[in-house]
Interface confidence: low
């Protein structure tokens, strides 16, 4: 068995999130998607979204903003009424062959 | 939150000071924690920047060169050092965390550095 | 470098006169904040977003504005109201200046 991981270009991987956040997953996905839809929270255009085990994937239709919000690094996102610290890291797309 | 900086320093030009800023209270490594520098009777200057989460520094113009921000992750604590001081140095300097839109929600009490020969 | 112009520099106000301040930036700015000083202490966040109030901030404070205005206001000056009163402006490169302050005396 042999893992094969690529740093997808495009794509960030938001981890952080309490235990005590109340909100579905459509709206934990819309919130992010608006967060990080604004240029001037760094980010871009979101064109695919997904809620994995503990975090979230946003890809954005744009080369760059994955990476200039993976330098940032540390945003403070309002969620569920709460400020909420959040971390931005590259995402790896990872498969078994 | 509190953030606790170290007591007041008296140094000679060409000293080093080293100013500690112990965080509490919060998760460290989940905010930011900036540096800003307020000479006597003036106002209030960005010096800078620390992620705490990847160690990555990034300084204002004014401050690259003699500055260095770096952290002890296991105590919270954030630290900014100062080489080859000068007189304009003398200054307040303040830690403060980087909060809800980047605003700095939280600050500590300053530490005084004096540069005097 | 986005500048950051606070104006005026020095101004006094009556117990229960309206105070307006104002902090103009050399170019469009993504996030503006004002922190309040009271001398030998720290700043506090005061207003951030442009017009969100900090915890305990009076409601008699308000903020606006957009692109490269924005101002802060008093609505009914108060005695515990004199301080210095900073404008910072947050965007991507550098991320942070501050403006030079309005000093804020009561008469």
């Known amino acids: 068995i042999q893992v094969m991981s690529q740093l997808s270009g495009r794509r960030v991987l938001v981890t952080g999130f309490p235990a005590s956040l109340r909100l579905s997953e459509e709206e934990l996905l819309d919130k992010l998607e608006i967060f990080f839809g604004k240029t001037r929270n760094g980010g871009g255009d979101v064109d695919v979204r997904e809620l994995l085990p503990g975090s979230v994937m946003l890809g954005f239709a744009r080369d760059g903003v994955a990476q200039r919000l993976c330098q940032i690094g540390q945003f403070t996102v309002p969620l569920g009424g709460q400020q909420v610290p959040l971390r931005v890291s590259p995402y790896v797309n990872g498969e078994i062959q | 939150v509190q953030l606790v900086e170290s007591g007041p320093e008296l140094k000679k030009p060409g000293e080093t000071v080293k100013i500690s800023c112990k965080a509490s209270g919060y998760t460290f490594t989940n905010y930011g924690m900036n540096w800003v520098k307020q000479a006597p009777g003036k106002g209030l200057k960005w010096m800078g920047w620390i992620n705490t989460y990847t160690g990555e520094p990034t300084f204002a113009d004014d401050f690259k060169g003699r500055f260095a921000f770096s952290l002890e992750t296991s105590a919270s604590t954030a630290y900014l050092q100062i080489n080859n001081l000068k007189n304009e140095d003398t200054a307040t300097y303040f830690c403060?965390?980087?909060?809800?839109?980047?605003?700095?929600?939280?600050w500590g009490q300053g530490t005084s550095v004096t540069v005097s020969s | 470098d986005i500048v950051m112009t606070q104006s005026p520099a020095i101004m006094s106000a009556s117990p229960g006169e309206k105070v307006t301040m104002t902090c103009s930036a050399s170019s469009s700015v993504s996030y503006m904040h004002w922190y309040q000083q009271k001398s030998g202490t720290s700043p506090k966040r005061w207003i951030y977003d442009t017009s969100k109030l900090a915890s305990g901030v009076p409601a008699r404070f308000s903020g606006s504005g957009s692109g490269t205005s924005y101002s802060l206001t008093i609505s009914s000056m108060e005695a515990e109201d004199a301080a210095t009163y900073y404008c910072q402006q947050w965007s991507s490169n550098p991320p942070i200046t501050f403006g030079a302050g309005t000093k804020l005396e009561i008469k």
């Open positions: 403060a965390r980087y909060g809800y839109s980047w605003a700095m929600d939280y």
